[in-house]
């Protein structure tokens, strides 16, 4: 069954945590659907964003952070492992120095920590996708 | 009650027709939600687009056409009558020489015909909005 989009969930992250998302683009890549995942510092959507991950399907991925309301230096990748009309599994793992983004089991993007992941209080998944799974796994102590 | 998004409906347009859309942005303008309305030449989403209307809420509106698979010259407007978190009523009227776009009863954008409106077979409304009304009215002969 489908989860509502935008999908918002409270989350606490630290080294070893993984956010897993399963979904599917809602339009053909010719029409440039988007997927966005934002790690927020508060439960409010206007809050700062520790890790912003935006896919323009068929075009590019941009990653960034929003600090004190201002977007910082954007990181762009042309790597496009997502396929038109096909389900994807996206997992974002918190490593000691960076986020590692896996697409369908393959390491596809990385983003160095700018703000400590412990600052994250909420994850939002949204834009032009249907969403079937959202999970945050925590490292067993 | 809400209509599904993306929302697709078969439509025939000519001078005097009006497409009316009521909806609401799904995110605060700080996060740049989009609204897109596309007038297609076929029932397929990959088909050419006679009139492409895309709002990046809080930022800009772009209008264009997609002919033989290729995007043409984009028309951009910074006019932003939409309000953060508020319902909007959008009406697109087919005039003899252009489309006239009204937002909440105010004439806000125009786009000269590049392809005759009679070529339209389908309208799609999508991206980051909830949709409560979609209507195509035809001029009484």
């Amino acid at each position: 069954s489908l989860l509502p989009v935008p999908y918002t969930e409270a989350a606490s992250l630290s080294t070893g945590s993984t956010v897993t998302i399963k979904g599917r683009p809602l339009a053909c890549f010719l029409n440039e659907p988007y997927l966005q995942v934002d790690f927020h510092t508060e439960m409010k959507e206007e809050s700062d964003i520790v890790f912003h991950f935006q896919v323009c399907f068929g075009r590019r991925v941009v990653m960034n952070s929003r600090e004190y309301g201002a977007w910082k230096q954007q990181v762009e990748s042309k790597n496009m492992p997502f396929q038109d009309g096909q389900e994807f599994e996206l997992s974002i793992s918190v490593l000691p120095d960076k986020y590692q983004v896996m697409v369908n089991g393959q390491s596809s993007y990385t983003f160095d920590h700018r703000i400590k992941p412990e600052a994250v209080k909420m994850v939002q998944v949204w834009r032009d996708i249907s969403l079937t799974k959202f999970n945050v796994s925590y490292l067993k102590r | 009650s809400l209509l599904p998004v993306p929302y697709t409906e078969a439509a025939s347009l000519s001078t005097g027709s009006t497409v009316t859309i009521k909806g609401r942005p799904l995110a605060c303008f700080l996060n740049e939600p989009y609204l897109q309305v596309d007038f297609h030449t076929e029932m397929k989403e990959e088909s050419d687009i006679v009139f492409h209307f895309q709002v990046c809420f809080g930022r800009r509106v772009v209008m264009n056409s997609r002919e033989y698979g290729a995007w043409k010259q984009q028309v951009e407007s910074k006019n932003m009558p939409f309000q953060d978190g508020q319902e909007f009523e959008l009406s697109i009227s087919v005039l003899p020489d252009k489309y006239q776009v009204m937002v909440n009863g105010q004439s806000s954008y125009t786009f000269d015909h590049r392809i005759k409106p009679e070529a339209v077979k389908m309208v799609q409304v999508w991206r980051d909005i909830s949709l409560t009304k979609f209507n195509v009215s035809y001029l009484k002969r």
Epitope: F29, E32, G58, R59, M80 | Y68
Partner: nanobody, 121 residues
């Protein structure tokens, strides 16, 4: 209708580089996603690389780190650069066009006839 014609194949030494070209004729080239596949003798056709209409790219694991795919929409041409070639890269290389960005040969709309690449050790 699109016509697809590959060129640039030939005999090369292991460790060398090669650039394959794919010329496409048809006014809708810019809206097609372009793919390279290859077929070794007696094997299935396999995906090598893709470039979306808007420039996103992907290379298969078998060529990752050795492959660059690019397109020039003004020249209606797609390029596949292959570095550090190995004997197992020997195959007929096919260029294909699709309205869907997928890595599945059955989803392609148009195919070229292929160009043979032979890598000798």
């Amino acid at each position: 209708e699109l016509q697809v014609v590959e060129s640039g194949g030939g005999l090369v030494q292991a460790g060398d580089s090669l650039r394959l070209s794919c010329a496409v004729s048809g006014r809708t080239f810019s809206s097609y996603h372009m793919m390279w596949f290859r077929q070794a003798p007696g094997k299935e056709r396999e995906f090598v690389a893709a470039i979306a209409w808007r420039g996103g790219t992907y290379c298969a694991n078998s060529v990752k780190g050795r492959c660059t795919i690019s397109r020039d929409n003004a020249k209606d041409t797609v390029y596949l650069q292959m570095n550090s070639l190995k004997p197992e890269d020997t195959a007929v290389y096919f260029c294909a066009a699709s309205l869907r960005y997928v890595f599945d040969p059955s989803a392609m709309d148009y195919w070229g006839k292929g160009t043979l690449v032979t890598v000798s050790s």
